[in-house]
């Protein structure tokens, strides 16, 4: 069982949070396309979280392809220090608060909220259920906490921590999982398995956040939610690593998978877009 292939490592609060992307195409694998040219291009590697060089064949491929390193960085990376731990008293909003509301390409329309930078308010929109961007919140309250100006002189960031304006200390927010743990993975790992609306019976895996394990379920072939993986390994990689166990002294123990040879394969369920 691959679940046993795990190690326990002490980590600090400053470890990078789960990867969340401003543009979903940044999660696509490098695609050289079917043609045979040799063109130096750059793509964003979600595993290293860096822009890297690859050879493009000259036709087709996908949007995770940039002429220059600078363009790649501009589209797919952010200044993590400024984004996650806001060090100034102004507490700038996360940059995704300024993105236009994006319904994505799917059609399983559900109510979500986005921050409207024109009205300076969080507003409702209809999200199609996949892709889109991070200006996309399950609740009005979550949107307000993250993107609207807080009444008490603080801004709440996107990773469940609240910045105290007096001393800039980070205060963990409460979570919906058992108190021994905090979940810092993608939010869909906390959702129940959802068969969807069609009639197929595909073998899939979902993360059961109650027992902390990936379990099989039958997927109908359409609809459902993002807690849906084609293999147990993918499920574990996306969700299991998100649980962090608190130690009484304030240190952290994180259960994370040993990095074996990574397959650079991205399915929809692996795209870390906010609250998909």
């Amino acid at each position: 069982d691959s679940e046993e292939d795990e190690e326990h490592t002490i980590i600090t609060d400053t470890e990078l949070p789960p990867l969340k992307l401003m543009h979903s195409f940044c999660a696509f694998k490098a695609d050289d396309g079917p043609c045979k040219a040799i063109m130096k291009r750059f793509f964003f590697n979600i595993f290293t979280r860096q822009c890297e060089e690859f050879i493009y064949g000259g036709c087709e491929g996908n949007q995770n392809r940039f002429e220059s390193l600078e363009e790649c960085k501009k589209m797919c990376t952010r200044d993590n220090a400024n984004r996650i731990i806001k060090t100034t008293l102004q507490q700038e909003k996360p940059d995704f608060c300024f993105l236009e509301e994006d319904p994505g390409i799917c059609r399983g329309y559900i109510t979500r909220y986005f921050y409207n930078n024109q009205t300076k308010q969080c507003e409702r929109f209809k999200y199609g259920g996949c892709l889109g961007n991070m200006n996309n919140f399950e609740t009005l309250e979550e949107c307000k906490n993250i993107c609207e100006d807080g009444p008490n002189g603080f801004q709440v960031d996107n990773y469940g921590t609240q910045l105290n304006a007096v001393n800039n200390s980070l205060t963990p927010q409460s979570t919906k999982v058992p108190s021994l743990f905090e979940f810092h993975g993608p939010s869909w790992c906390l959702t129940p398995a959802d068969r969807g609306l069609c009639r197929a019976n595909e073998n899939r895996f979902y993360y059961n956040s109650v027992i902390g394990k990936c379990r099989p379920f039958k997927y109908s072939g359409c609809g459902g939610n993002e807690n849906n993986f084609t293999s147990k390994q993918e499920c574990l990689r996306a969700c299991k690593k998100g649980f962090i166990q608190r130690i009484s002294k304030g240190g952290l123990i994180k259960t994370k998978r040993k990095r074996k040879k990574q397959r650079v394969k991205i399915a929809y369920e692996e795209i870390f877009v906010k609250n998909m």
Epitope: E100, E101, Y109, T111, T119, R124, F125, T139
Partner: antibody
Framework: EVQLVESGGGLVKPGGSLRLSCAAS????????MNWVRQAPGKGLEWVST????????YYADSVDGRFTISRDNAKNSLYLQMNSLRAEDTAVYYC???????????WGQGTLVTVSS | DVVMTQTPLSLPVTLGQPASISCKSS???????????LNWLQQRPGQSPKRLIY???KLDSGVPDRFTGSGSGTDFTLKISRVEAEDVGVYYC?????????FGQGTKVEIK
């Protein structure tokens, strides 16, 4: 006062094209998603299309998807509907309507009549 | 798509008397955010639609308080406590909970 004024309607043959416009005033146009809704003669209302605040993303009714294109020019406070491959069943009064913060239509224009007939 | 069914389709009323229009949806209009996005429009003869009520019971600004909206789930009602001449027209319910937005067939209110 919020005002929405549609124009561009008229008589067109089946298979033809038409471009409707909606001029908005009295509010900050770029702050609002916008819609087109139509009403066939003597019939009820049918939602046609919605465009997001910045104009990058769109929603369409199945009946018009692939034939109609909604767009906007925030600098000109204008909403557009490009209608191609028109059919007799597209005959209707076309209204533009503003979307409020609840993603609900609040203000409507006076409408422009599109007649598709040979 | 969600089907909205209005009754009656025609409603002759006497001035000063109450009127009531029913609207039923084919599925619940309670959204995942706990709100119910059921709305009412008024379309006077020869005019464009005007929003009267949103979120079941909230009156738009300038709408007289003789109009009231109520209901939950799949059953909704628009009531006019005392009909006035300016209330003549077609009233539509429509839902904004599920996409695409869908409308009722309309109820024509006329004076007897």
């Amino acid at each position: 006062e919020v005002q929405l004024v549609e124009s561009g309607g008229g008589l067109v043959k089946p298979g033809g094209s038409l471009r409707l416009s909606c001029a908005a005033s009295g509010f900050t146009f770029s702050s609002y998603a916008m819609n087109w809704v139509r009403q066939a003669p003597g019939k009820g209302l049918e939602w046609v299309s919605t465009i997001t605040t910045g104009g990058s993303y769109t929603y369409y009714a199945d009946s018009v998807d692939g034939r109609f294109t909604i767009s906007r020019d925030n600098a000109k406070n204008s909403l557009y509907l490009q209608m191609n491959s028109l059919r007799a069943e597209d005959t209707a009064v076309y209204y533009c309507a503003r979307q409020d913060g609840h993603f609900l239509m609040d203000y409507w224009g006076q409408g422009t009549l599109v007649t598709v007939s040979s | 798509d969600v089907v909205m069914t209005q009754t009656p389709l025609s409603l002759p009323v006497t001035l000063g008397q109450p009127a009531s229009i029913s609207c039923k949806s084919s599925q619940s209009l309670l959204d995942i955010d706990g709100k119910t996005y059921l709305n009412w429009l008024q379309q006077r003869p020869g005019q464009s639609p005007k929003r009267l009520i949103y979120l079941v019971s909230k009156l738009d600004s300038g709408v007289p308080d003789r109009f009231t909206g109520s209901g939950s789930g799949t059953d909704f009602t628009l009531k006019i406590s005392r009909v006035e001449a300016e209330d003549v027209g077609v009233y539509y319910c429509w839902q904004g909970t599920h996409f695409p937005f869908t409308f009722g067939q309309g109820t024509k209110v006329e004076i007897k």
